[in-house]
């Protein structure tokens, strides 16, 4: 609806009256409107609302509103709609970031790696290797490395030390009278041969001579995965290598205990870039195409101390 009344705070603009050639000073129209009729010696300027598909951000003296930008190209979504006061703004949906005028999925940090820096709509996730004492057992674009389960605090012992990719497996020593096998339904995380694990305090070991193996594993490339929920854990890079171990060495009869420890229990830290979280030593790399500084190929450990 045309508006004729000018606010006291509205600025002015100059307009040349075509009929008389006279330079007139008119009141500007408010944002979201345009000048449908300029002022004359005897009348105020007339403002009209911007038609659909157009806008003006500020008070103005223009005769036509600006056209809004084109609809957001897939896969972008509208951050701001086209309205009388605002132009359409496009952004990348959750789990993606703007790259070369389109949206690319956030890098998925592979197993053994955690998120060092969260991704945003304009910046990719940055991954880091889990450091000593931490691990990541699922590919994720939101989760940091998690600290190993503290078996001792649960009055249990470590029957399988954690790696960058697996948590400690806790268990109890059976009584001499009965030998118990792992209870059904509990997962004993397999540790591939030739895998380096993080050092675990010796006080948590019961089986003697059980050192983790060390060597390289080839990196496995996984497809990108979109994740919209941020895990609250922070990475901690504190892993250390242990001596060689005969992976096939049999353990004494130990009972495996379910940890029931979700990522929300974990606190991870980043120190030197790796002071974030780290876990086992198996090589894997963040899944992504050529991207700035994301780890590729080998395992990378930064001095980080992050906590979940």
């Amino acid at each position: 609806q045309p508006e004729q009344k000018a606010s006291n705070l509205i600025g002015t603009y100059r307009h040349v009256d075509r009929a008389t050639g006279q330079v007139l000073t008119c009141d500007k129209c408010p944002a979201g409107t345009y000048v449908s009729e300029h002022c004359t010696n005897t009348s105020l300027r007339v403002c009209s609302s911007c038609p659909v598909g157009t806008f003006t951000r500020h008070e103005n003296g223009i005769e036509k509103c600006h056209d809004c930008s084109q609809p957001c190209p897939w896969p972008m979504i509208e951050k701001l709609p086209c309205a009388a006061l605002t132009d359409r703004e496009c952004t990348c949906p959750p789990g993606m970031f703007q790259s070369n005028a389109t949206c690319a999925p956030h890098t998925v940090c592979p197993v053994g790696w955690g998120v060092r820096k969260k991704g945003t709509e304009t910046e990719d996730v940055r991954c880091k290797q889990c450091a000593r004492g931490t691990f990541s057992d699922v590919p994720s674009s939101v989760m940091k490395c998690k600290a190993y389960t503290d078996c001792l605090s649960q009055n249990l012992v470590v029957i399988k030390p954690g790696t960058k990719e697996t948590d400690n497996v806790c268990g109890t020593l059976p009584s001499f009278s009965s030998s118990t096998s792992p209870s059904p339904g509990t997962a004993i995380f397999p540790r591939p041969e030739h895998m380096e694990t993080h050092e675990v305090p010796s006080s948590t070991y019961v089986p003697k001579g059980m050192n983790s193996t060390e060597s390289n594993s080839s990196a496995s490339v996984r497809p990108k995965v979109l994740s919209s929920i941020q895990e609250g854990t922070v990475p901690d890079n504190t892993s250390s290598a242990r001596g060689k171990e005969d992976v096939n060495k049999t353990l004494p009869n130990l009972q495996v205990v379910n940890h029931q420890q979700g990522p929300h229990h974990r606190h991870i830290l980043k120190l030197l870039p790796s002071m974030e979280a780290t876990g086992g030593e198996k090589s894997s790399t963040p899944i992504k195409g050529p991207k700035r500084g994301h780890p590729r190929q080998n395992l990378h450990k930064h001095f980080d101390i992050n906590e979940h």
Epitope: Q129, N216, K270, P273, M275, E281, R296, L299, H300
Partner: antibody
């Protein structure tokens, strides 16, 4: 046994350059993030730079950004720190450290920047 | 000035309990793991505590670490003369996108 041995330190004039090396042994070097941490005489520890295991990503303290370059040669199990445009305040013992947790450190090499 | 604040010194007699504090903020200690390092006179630092409260093998159980909120602490029970050293806390800082160290605490055994 994990061992880290730094070398390359010495006396250099302001504006000069030095290249530090850290020879690693006793572990799978290519699997670890590595870092440089320094300690000025009588002062505390200051993180300088870190590099991923593959060398794919590097991080630098603001105080050395643009002047220092961290790199590694996994085939030689060696970490490097190229230091250019050295200043008096860069005088320190430079340590290399393994892993994000800095679980093992070298014995350090002294860099003195003085005219 | 360090992002992490430690008392410059702490002392105790043999057998006593000494605690060193390390104060930070949400962007560092509050959201990340804390590490502690011991530096004996004239030697390189050594990892003492990782992921807030874990000890590497070889570190006596007299040393314990804890974290609460934006602060962490290192406790030494049954203080011994060989514990005389500088102790540093460290963590990652999300805002700086870098590791940070405390200024260090010199522990003296009286």
């Amino acid at each position: 046994e994990v061992q880290l041995l730094e070398s390359g330190g010495g006396l250099v004039q302001p504006g000069g350059s030095l290249r530090l090396s850290c020879a690693a042994s006793g572990f799978t070097f290519s699997n670890y993030e590595m870092s440089w941490v320094r300690q000025a005489p009588g002062k505390g520890l200051e993180w300088v730079s870190s590099i991923y295991s593959s060398g794919g990503e590097t991080l630098y303290a603001d105080s050395v950004k643009g002047r220092f370059t961290i790199s590694r040669d996994n085939s030689k199990n060696t970490l490097y720190l190229q230091m250019n445009s050295l200043r008096a305040e860069d005088t320190a013992v430079y340590y290399c450290a393994r892993d994000g947790a800095a679980d093992y450190w070298g014995q350090g090499t002294l860099v003195t920047v003085s005219s | 000035q360090s992002e992490l604040t430690q008392p410059p010194s702490a002392s105790g007699t043999p057998g006593q309990w000494v605690t060193i504090s390390c104060s930070g903020s949400t962007s560092n200690i509050g959201n990340n793991y804390v590490y502690w390092y011991q530096q004996l006179p004239g030697t390189a630092p050594k990892l003492l505590i990782y992921t807030n409260n874990q000890r590497p093998s070889g570190v006596p159980d007299r040393f314990s670490g804890s974290k609460s909120g934006t602060s962490a602490s290192l406790a030494i029970s049954g203080l011994r003369s060989e514990d005389e050293a500088d102790y540093y806390c460290a963590t990652w800082d999300d805002s700086l996108y870098a590791p940070v160290f405390g200024g260090g605490t010199k522990v003296t055994v009286l």
